[in-house]
């Protein structure tokens, strides 16, 4: 009965794969797939290159990268040849007005006068009360504080120069970075004139300076890296070895390890149930009920009512029950999963080069990101700079008649305005001309290009690895039948025949991701809107798109495996992969979860191991090491520890992603093998003896004088 039902289910997801006597693993005789998409992708890349060239021709990233004074003149060039650094009169106004978009579009522009200086101020200084009536010459020029805007007369009153923002009212010890003077040391600021009654700003400035400590910290960080880089590399080497070791040792310990992990999860859930029960009992005896609490948005309040703990107890109990039932009734599936993991470990051992393929992917991703970043930067600076009239305080007497934000010439500053602090400042880039008018569209094109190329590179990696691992599975006599250079041949084969299919899959994913980005942007814009219906709809949309992206990633991954094996187009491969998986849905879920659990534990082991070792080493807790192994003296010992941990995570993720791909590929091959073959002499199974044993199947032994037909 159950068998008949299963057959019906299988029928719904297509017929099992028929035996094909010519099939010997990844097909050799292939033709190009998804040619239209390939052409489209190549045209798009060509367009992307054209956009890059146009951006390069029209753009001037100096406008963003190099500092410019209030008049728009570059520091360190022309008239400011000897003044390479930019000083902001009030850098805190930059902090208050800067965001990532304005920086991307306009560079580091701030609503405060900016002047090119030969060197950054070294000492903290504020205009003293008694200096307001002095001359600019006495206060600034003779004291080597040449930080006023050009052309301020020597005998001008300081108070009027400050009112017009021609000179800075305070200076902070600064260090040049990106050609700009940034404050660094923890200065105790003297009373800041004019803003002393504005406590918030005064405290904010002092707090910022105290907390920044930027130069001291950056110097110390640099010193720490200089002293510990060698040991960080050692830690990363350890992470690399641990990851490899973990993957290679899986063939020996996969069974016991999975069992221990599952029992561990059961144990954690059991403890959770016990804890929830205890909390529930205590609160029940106290009579603490949700009815007494009423409705509240304070989530922590729910911890003190019995219903919360009862609900948690029920959820955990259900999970525990499900896991126990899975363990009892799906023993066979778990054993298959373990055997596949062992097989994957063997495959990686046979083809160690695959473990380092993520480096290729990383480099390609880096190229894509760098190209996009440069193009975006050049595009953002492709217009003529535009300048507008601006005053720091438009409510000052004399400013009411001034048309703020009207265009002006920066070389002809409004030095004689009745409006204090009126300046001609850089606003952005003009949108005159075809390129400038199309700027937004070109930037959108660039973003699309970024997503598509990134997804294509990731797809390429998956397909190449799938091709390599499939050639391992479909080698009847291992390792003799494995191709000599499985990874390189898979790489060439994929690039030559399946660029279009990968581009198709990547495009579908890109469109979903772009939709998600747009949705995130809309959500960000609607943050202030308190309409619960709108927020609920937005949340649903975001959730749906997140699920859709997850599903497409899963589908693409398996489609690429099918493409690697059979060389069919994307749609056919995706359909075949999907139907094959749906016919074996229980196996899929079990394998997926077991692999996830194992790889999570692997990452934990690698990162935790490196973290613990780094902690004990860098904090000097390991005694009795030889002179060569003495831990360096550090300002912040947590710095190399955190670097080692992050590096270890990246390395482990890279290795385990390869392993994950290997498991998925072998799993699909295994399912194909089960449907395609029957263990007879003509149709022997390609799977390992351990898998055959678990399934209770075996290959017919050929007579001694006969060799298996090839």
């Amino acid at each position: 009965m159950g068998g008949k039902q299963r057959d019906k289910d299988d029928e719904a997801y297509g017929k099992p794969v028929k035996y094909d006597p010519s099939f010997r693993g990844p097909i050799k005789n292939r033709s190009c797939t998804d040619v239209i998409c390939c052409v489209l992708f190549l045209l798009f890349i060509l367009g992307y290159i054209v956009v890059g060239i146009v951006a390069w021709l029209y753009g001037d990233p100096r406008q963003v990268l190099y500092p410019r004074n209030s008049t728009g003149a570059y520091c360190g060039m022309g008239e400011n040849k000897d003044k390479p650094y930019l000083l902001y009169f009030n850098i805190f106004s930059c902090i208050l007005s800067t965001n990532i978009i304005s920086v991307a579009e306009n560079g580091l522009q701030c609503p405060t006068p900016q002047v090119c200086v030969s060197s950054c101020p070294e000492d903290p200084w504020t205009v003293g009360k008694n200096q307001f009536s002095q001359t600019v010459g006495e206060v600034f020029y003779t004291k080597n504080r040449n930080f006023c805007l050009p052309g301020v007369p020597w005998n001008m009153m300081v108070i009027t120069s400050l009112q017009q923002e021609l000179c800075p009212s305070f200076l902070l010890p600064s260090a040049p970075a990106l050609g700009r003077c940034f404050p660094w040391t923890n200065v105790t600021l003297p009373e800041l004139p004019g803003i002393t009654n504005d406590t918030t700003i005064a405290q904010g400035i002092s707090g910022l300076i105290d907390s920044l400590n930027a130069r001291d910290i950056s110097v110390k960080i640099f010193e720490d890296f200089a002293h510990s880089w060698y040991w960080i590399l050692v830690a990363l080497g350890v992470a690399l070895l641990l990851s490899l070791l973990f993957i290679l040792l899986l063939r020996l310990v996969a069974g016991p390890l999975v069992l221990v992990l599952i029992l561990g999860v059961l144990g954690v859930l059991a403890y959770g149930i016990y804890y929830c029960w205890e909390e529930y009992r205590v609160l029940r005896d106290k009579g603490a009920s949700i009815s007494q609490l009423g409705f509240t948005t304070n989530l922590s309040a729910y911890q003190s009512v019995q219903e919360t703990w009862l609900a948690a107890l029920i959820v955990l109990a259900v999970l525990e029950a499900i896991l126990l039932l899975v363990l009892i009734f799906l023993r066979q599936r778990i054993r298959i999963a373990i055997a596949l993991l062992k097989e994957a470990s063997k495959a990686v051992g046979q083809m160690m080069s695959t473990m380092f393929y993520p480096l290729v992917t990383f480099v390609l991703l880096l190229i894509c990101i760098a190209y996009w970043a440069m193009t975006a930067l050049y595009l953002a600076t492709s217009g003529q700079p535009q300048y507008v009239l601006w005053a720091s305080n438009i409510s000052s007497p004399g400013c009411e008649k001034v048309s703020i934000n009207t265009s002006c010439n920066p070389m002809d500053q409004p030095v004689n305005s009745s409006c204090p602090g009126l300046m001609c400042v850089f606003q952005g880039y003009s949108s005159k001309g075809l390129v400038q008018r199309s700027l937004f569209n070109l930037q959108i094109y660039g973003v699309l290009g970024l997503f598509w190329t990134l997804n294509w590179v990731l797809a390429l990696g998956q397909c190449v690895l799938a091709g390599a691992f499939a050639s391992f599975y479909w080698a009847f006599h291992k390792p003799q039948d494995i191709p000599t250079f499985p990874l390189i041949s898979a790489f060439i084969r994929t690039l030559r025949y399946h660029t279009g299919s990968l581009a198709f899959g990547a495009l579908i994913l890109t469109l979903v991701q772009i939709a998600r980005v747009i949705l995130e942007y809309i959500d960000h814009k609607l943050r202030g809107v308190q309409n619960p219906v709108a927020r609920c709809i937005m949340c649903c949309f975001k959730c749906c798109l997140w699920c859709l992206e997850k599903f497409i990633k899963f589908l693409n991954r398996n489609a690429y495996i099918m493409i690697a094996i059979y060389g069919k187009n994307f749609c056919v491969s995706a359909k075949n992969a999907f139907t094959l998986l749906m016919r074996n849905i229980v196996r899929v879920v079990v394998l997926d979860k077991v692999t996830d659990l194992l790889l999570f534990f692997g990452k934990l082991l690698v990162v935790g191991g490196v973290g613990v070792l780094s902690f004990f080493f860098f904090s000097g807790r390991i005694q009795g090491l030889g002179r060569d192994f003495k831990s360096p003296h550090l300002n912040y010992y947590w710095l190399p520890i955190m670097t080692s941990i992050m590096g270890a995570y990246v390395i482990a993720s890279g290795f385990f992603s390869v392993f994950g791909m290997c498991v998925d590929t072998l799993f699909l091959c295994f399912l194909e093998d089960l449907e395609r073959n029957d263990g007879s002499l003509d149709r022997p199974y390609y799977m390992s003896k351990s898998l055959l044993k678990i399934l209770g199947k075996k290959n017919e032994a050929p007579p001694d004088n006969k060799k298996r037909k090839k």
Epitope: K129, F132, S133, P153, M157, G398, N416, S418, C419, P420
Partner: antibody, heavy 125, light 107 residues
């Protein structure tokens, strides 16, 4: 109300000295800058010197630099102008004037507001 | 030093006339300009400061405008008590300097 009264003017021979005084009342003298302005007979106004509230910062017109000294005694609410090496061209009515800037304001400077009635200095042989 | 010039140096007007006096600075002085009124034998009196702000107690018929190098004092409707000499003064760069004055007398 705010009042400034000048004294000490008179007829003096060239090369001699004279000391003018300006008595202030009706405001906190020690908080304000004070100016001397002169007006030659039939001519326009000429700014001579300024002394700021704490007496530390003093500025003069070039024609009197090194000969005239502006000073103040905040305890007596009095402003002084010590004139040495007097010349015929120093003949004028000398006014003292209060500056609007009181040192407690920060970014606003608006110049002089209240003037005294003036004292006449005649330099003649 | 900043030179201040006034035009006209004198003008004759009748009661009720609208009178405009112009003051020019040899270099930009922003809005640091004051206007004073002086009657014969009397001390000068402050009318306008910061180029356009009216001194308290001064009637609103007096108004000032301009910035940078060109400034104007306007008396919207001349009254008998307004016949006097008017001086402009810059007070941003030492030494502070006055204009030569504009004498307003009866036509």
């Amino acid at each position: 109300q705010v009042q400034l009264v000048e004294s000490g003017g008179g007829v003096v021979q060239p090369g001699r000295s004279l000391r003018l005084s300006c008595a202030a009342s009706g405001f906190t003298f020690s908080s304000y800058g004070m100016h001397w302005v002169r007006q030659a007979p039939g001519k326009g106004l000429e700014w001579v010197a300024v002394i700021w509230y704490d007496g530390r910062n003093k500025y003069y017109v070039d024609s009197v630099k090194g000969r005239f000294t502006i000073s103040r005694d905040n305890s007596k609410n009095t402003l002084y102008l010590q004139m040495n090496s007097l010349r015929a061209e120093d003949t004028a009515v000398y006014y003292c004037a209060r500056d609007r800037y009181s040192g407690s304001d920060y970014y606003y400077y608006y110049g002089m507001d209240v003037w005294g009635q003036g004292t006449t200095v005649t330099v003649s042989s | 030093d900043i030179q201040m010039t006034q035009s006209p140096s004198s003008l004759s007007a009748s009661v009720g006339d609208r009178v405009t006096i112009t003051c020019r600075a040899s270099q930009g002085i922003y809005n640091y300009l004051a206007w004073f009124q002086q009657k014969p034998g009397k001390a000068p009196k402050s009318l306008i400061y910061a180029a356009s702000s009216l001194q308290s107690g001064v009637p609103s018929k007096f108004s000032g405008s301009g910035s940078g190098t060109v400034f104007t004092l306007t008396i919207s409707s001349l009254q008998p008590e307004d016949f006097a000499t008017y001086y402009c003064q810059q007070y941003t760069v030492y030494p502070f300097t006055f204009g030569p004055g504009t004498k307003v007398d009866f036509k």
